[in-house]
């Protein structure tokens, strides 16, 4: 008798005999920027403080009739999903509501900005525990709204937003496109993307994860004990705001980067049917459905990594694409991908005191993506070692020569347009795991890191015949930090990490001759941190 | 998720003006930009967020807003400062004619200006 959405986000160990996780989120304050709410609804009475903040445009239409229950509908439901007594995710969380949407559910970028500023000022006047800000709204791409979200996030606030209900690329909307915001798409009881009339959930690289967002039972503003089902990416975002409140209550010192990595780590993987998404968006859209961690204890011993895709470079000959990690994350590897296969590889380079991943388009290419592997690695000291194109026929090599540094990723970049078209493959000599190898005409970049207790190993999976996709996964307890293709094949479209699996994609096999060039090898670098494990054991 | 990704329109307008010799005029060569929502029905022309450079103080924001009002008045335009931002971003929200955008982009400390637009419950 527990609603499907609460069951879905609850780990199996909690499900017996209707048992739900303990009332969580009590140390956290969740700000809701939405419509007005019915604060005396039984679900949220005493949990939601209605602030005096209101900045909404006039309702459209001369004959618009303001009906309180309709004005309150959206916000009341979301407040209930976050913290409702019976149908809420974080039943212990307290909330504050700001009215930025009118009775028709419409607001302005400027009103939202002033609301975010109000939260920042409140935080400065009366610092409390962790803050979560839920933005269940979307407008067109807005530089200023994204900038405000970035500033608030850098002030230590966790922002969660709806991906949008436009069945479109979330990067075209704000605040969904802001990198610092946790952007949430919607799935249904069958773990499929939510369809809303002719539209549906947004998707793409700006979405961080999905969460239940169809037929979500929650507080109805029709009466003080009423419930109603609503659907949308707002409902999905409210689930993640609730999960974030639970996590932050258990571990109040979590940074935004740590929280995001944990949300990704504890999500259900590969359950969404990607066929719903446009073909060009499938690889970019995370196949993750949010869930609560299996216990409220921290998972600090784990090495957490996530994959960050860049925007598309565009088709011009010298076009590049850049993928960046969050300020608290380390870039441990860099790869690239092009649907046409025409690319000139990728390299890690310093930009503003931080490493970024840059991918290069090739002449005649339709454009490339840069793919960064972004990890939480405390006390890390990482650097990039580069070997220019080699003169010798045996190929280019580079390794981590500094004491205590381990290889976390390999990248290669070349100036010639079609590297490998008529060149034999180069094979890595066995027993040299700490080195990257590549074509003699390519420059090779090794990501070398020193961190307490960090150990890494190379894992390969080669297929002699042409395959559209070759994968290699890291085993339990190890985290994928690097993903690349062994050089030598002209038809490799690129490599990227999906959760703990390295994926190497090749051109349609029907167009490739079954020669030795058809051989594809996926190379994964798998790491773990003994230091983090020890620190966790000492805490417990 | 970078700024340059968005499917929005950017209009770059020249900064130098013979008509207004401004004190604190921006350094030569810097360009303030104008942004507006790519989805036309969601645009709200007539209200603009003027974003100032990162280290601008509240007093400078207020001074810049007043300067815009004064220069607009000299051209016969009414403007209304709806809000002065500080705490997150330095800047101000102004209700004015779009005819004044070129003038506003030339003000000292201006980083960019964005036309207001609608957001919707999802």
């Amino acid at each position: 008798s527990i609603p499907w959405n609460l069951e879905r986000i609850t780990p199996p160990r909690y499900r017996a005999d209707e048992y739900q996780p303990p009332d969580g989120g009590s140390l956290v304050e969740v700000y809701l920027l939405d419509t007005s709410i019915q604060s005396d609804h039984r679900e949220i009475e005493g949990r939601v403080m209605v602030t005096d903040f209101e900045n909404v445009p006039e309702e459209d239409g001369t004959r618009f009739h303001r009906q309180a229950s309709k004005c309150d509908s959206h916000g009341t439901h979301l407040a209930g999903v976050v913290s409702g007594r019976d149908a809420g995710v974080a039943k212990g969380a307290s909330m504050r509501s700001l009215r930025v949407l009118n009775c028709q559910g419409k607001g302005t970028v400027s009103g939202t900005l002033i609301g975010l500023e109000f939260i920042r000022k409140s935080q400065l006047v009366q610092p409390v525990g962790p803050l979560v800000v839920l933005l269940p709204l979307a407008g067109g791409y807005s530089r200023v709204l994204n900038a405000a979200c970035q500033r608030l996030a850098r002030a230590g606030v966790v922002l969660v937003t709806a991906a949008g209900n436009f069945r479109d690329d979330a990067c075209l909307y704000s605040p969904a496109s802001a990198p610092e915001v946790i952007t949430v798409g919607a799935t249904n009881a069958q773990d499929q993307p939510v369809t809303l009339g002719t539209l549906g959930t947004n998707f793409g690289r700006c979405v961080d994860l999905f969460a239940p967002g169809e037929d979500i039972i929650g507080a109805s503003s029709d009466c003080s004990t009423c419930f109603v089902s609503q659907s949308g990416t707002s409902q999905a975002a409210a689930h993640v705001a609730g999960i974030a409140a639970m996590m932050l209550s258990a571990e109040p010192e979590l940074t935004l980067a740590e929280l995001r990595q944990r949300l990704i780590h504890f999500s259900a993987k590969d359950v969404i049917n990607e066929a719903w998404f446009p073909e060009d968006q499938r690889v970019l859209t995370p196949n993750l459905v949010a869930a609560l961690p299996p216990s409220t204890h921290g998972a600090g011993w784990q090495l957490f990594c996530r994959t960050v895709w860049s925007a598309h470079s565009g088709p011009t000959r010298m076009a590049t694409a850049v993928a960046r990690c969050a300020p608290d994350e380390e870039l441990l590897s860099c790869s690239s991908f092009s649907r046409s296969g025409k690319r000139r590889g990728e390299r890690m380079e310093a930009q503003g005191g931080k490493l970024v991943c840059r991918a290069h388009n090739a002449f005649g290419g339709e454009g490339v993506y840069a793919i960064a592997r972004c990890c939480l690695l405390p006390q890390a000291n990482c650097s990039v070692h580069t070997a220019p194109p080699a003169e010798a026929s045996m190929g280019t090599r580079v390794h981590c020569h500094q004491q205590g540094h381990v290889l976390t990723g390999c990248s290669s970049h070349w100036e010639v347009e079609d590297l490998g078209t008529h060149k034999p493959p180069v094979l890595r000599p066995r027993g040299q795991p700490n080195q990257c190898v590549g074509h003699r005409e390519a420059s090779i970049h090794a990501s070398c890191c020193h961190a307490p207790g960090l150990e890494c190993k190379v894992k390969e999976h080669g297929i002699p015949a042409p395959q559209e996709q070759v994968t290699v996964a890291c085993e339990e307890g190890w985290t994928l930090t690097g993903c690349s293709a062994l050089p030598g094949t002209s038809h490799v479209l690129g490599a990227y990490a999906v959760d703990n699996t390295c994926v190497v994609r090749s051109r349609d096999v029907s167009t490739t001759g079954s020669t030795s060039e058809g051989a594809v090898t996926a190379v994964a670098i798998c790491c773990r941190s003994r230091h983090l494990a020890q620190a966790s054991q000492e805490l417990q | 998720q970078e700024d340059e990704d968005g499917d929005y329109e950017e209009l770059v307008l020249a900064l130098r003006s013979e008509e207004d010799g401004l004190a604190e005029a921006p350094e030569h060569g810097t360009t303030a930009t104008f942004h507006r929502c790519a989805k036309d029905p969601w645009r709200l022309p007539g209200t603009y967020v003027v974003v100032l450079k990162e280290e601008t103080h509240l007093s400078q924001s207020e001074r810049t807003a007043r300067r815009l009002q004064a220069q607009a008045a000299r051209r016969g335009y009414l403007t209304k400062i709806l809000h002065v931002f500080h705490g997150l971003l330095p800047g101000f929200l102004v209700k004015m004619s779009g005819d004044l955008l070129e003038l506003a982009l030339k003000l000292p400390h201006v980083d960019y200006i964005e036309e207001d637009s609608s957001v919707f419950a999802q």
């Epitope: 008798s1 527990i2 609603p3 209707e18 739900q20 009332d23 005396d40 039984r42 229950s69 007594r85 019976d86 149908a87 039943k91 039972i217 029709d222 009466c223 003080s224 004990t225 009423c226 419930f227 | -």
Partner: antibody
Framework: QLQLQESGPGLVKPSETLSLTCTVS??????????WTWIRQPPGKGLEWIGS???????YYNPSLKSRVTISVDTSKNQFSLKLSSVTAADTAVYYC??????????????????WGQGTLVTVSS | EIVLTQSPATLSLSPGERATLSCRAS??????LAWYQQKPGQAPRLLIY???NRATGIPARFSGSGSGTDFTLTISSLEPEDFAVYYC????????FGGGTKVEIK
């Protein structure tokens, strides 16, 4: 079939605390589908809702009585209790306990008070 | 709070007659109104919920109608066991009850 039974002292002195317990039989108080409610009826007068509690111990009180009311639940004993502090003669009434469907699971039944206990008269007098 | 006013306070009718009881709310309660029957020395019993739905085991002679602020409970043909006090109750905003209508034998 679910039954509710109120118990507690029938006489309480003014300024003291009234304490009543409702024992639920024929069903579990630990179900997430229900709220457990106290309602009172002064002699010859109408009904007044006092407050409700769910199996997690989350409470919801009548605003006019909130400062004096405490409702608690003991799922191990299948009981819930009412405490009303600083009583006066105006608190003399028949006190009923009742079940209310929370509304989260529509299949659990209508979102109203049903069934009720038979009621217990509490007189406030010195 | 929402005040419910019941009328008449007392209704004197004979068995077999039709009874019409009224409940008026001080503001709209939509359809979130119920009717209860209470016999002397007994607890109230739910008859009608959400303005017009009969509760389990309630005879078809009981019917409810109305929405917003005006509601009616109709007993099409009074049986001897129907003589009792009837209360309306709303849940639009918290929970409040009407003052009751006593249906007595004429």
């Amino acid at each position: 079939q679910l039954q509710l039974q109120e118990s507690g002292p029938g006489l309480v002195k003014p300024s003291e605390t009234l304490s009543l317990t409702c024992t639920v039989s024929g069903g579990s108080i630990g179900s997430s589908s229900y709220y457990w409610t106290w309602i009172r009826q002064p002699p010859g007068k109408g009904l007044e809702w006092i407050g409700s509690i769910n199996y997690r111990g989350s409470t919801y009180y009548n605003p006019s009585l909130k400062s004096r009311v405490t409702i608690s639940v003991d799922t191990s004993k299948n009981q819930f209790s009412l405490k009303l502090s600083s009583v006066t003669a105006a608190d003399t009434a028949v006190y009923y306990c009742a079940r209310e469907n929370s509304g989260v699971v529509p299949a659990a039944g209508p979102n109203w008070f049903d069934p009720w206990g038979q009621g217990t008269l509490v007189t406030v007098s010195s | 709070e929402i005040v419910l006013t019941q009328s008449p306070a007392t209704l004197s009718l004979s068995p077999g007659e039709r009874a019409t009881l009224s409940c008026r709310a001080s503001q709209s309660v939509s359809s979130y109104l119920a009717w209860y029957q209470q016999k002397p020395g007994q607890a109230p019993r739910l008859l009608i919920y959400d303005a017009s739905n009969r509760a389990t085991g309630i005879p078809a002679r009981f019917s409810g109608s109305g929405s917003g602020t005006d509601f009616t409970l109709t007993i099409s043909s009074l049986e001897p066991e129907d003589f009792a006090v009837y209360y309306c109750q709303q849940r639009r905003n918290w929970f409040t009850f009407g003052g009751g209508t006593k249906v007595e034998i004429k």
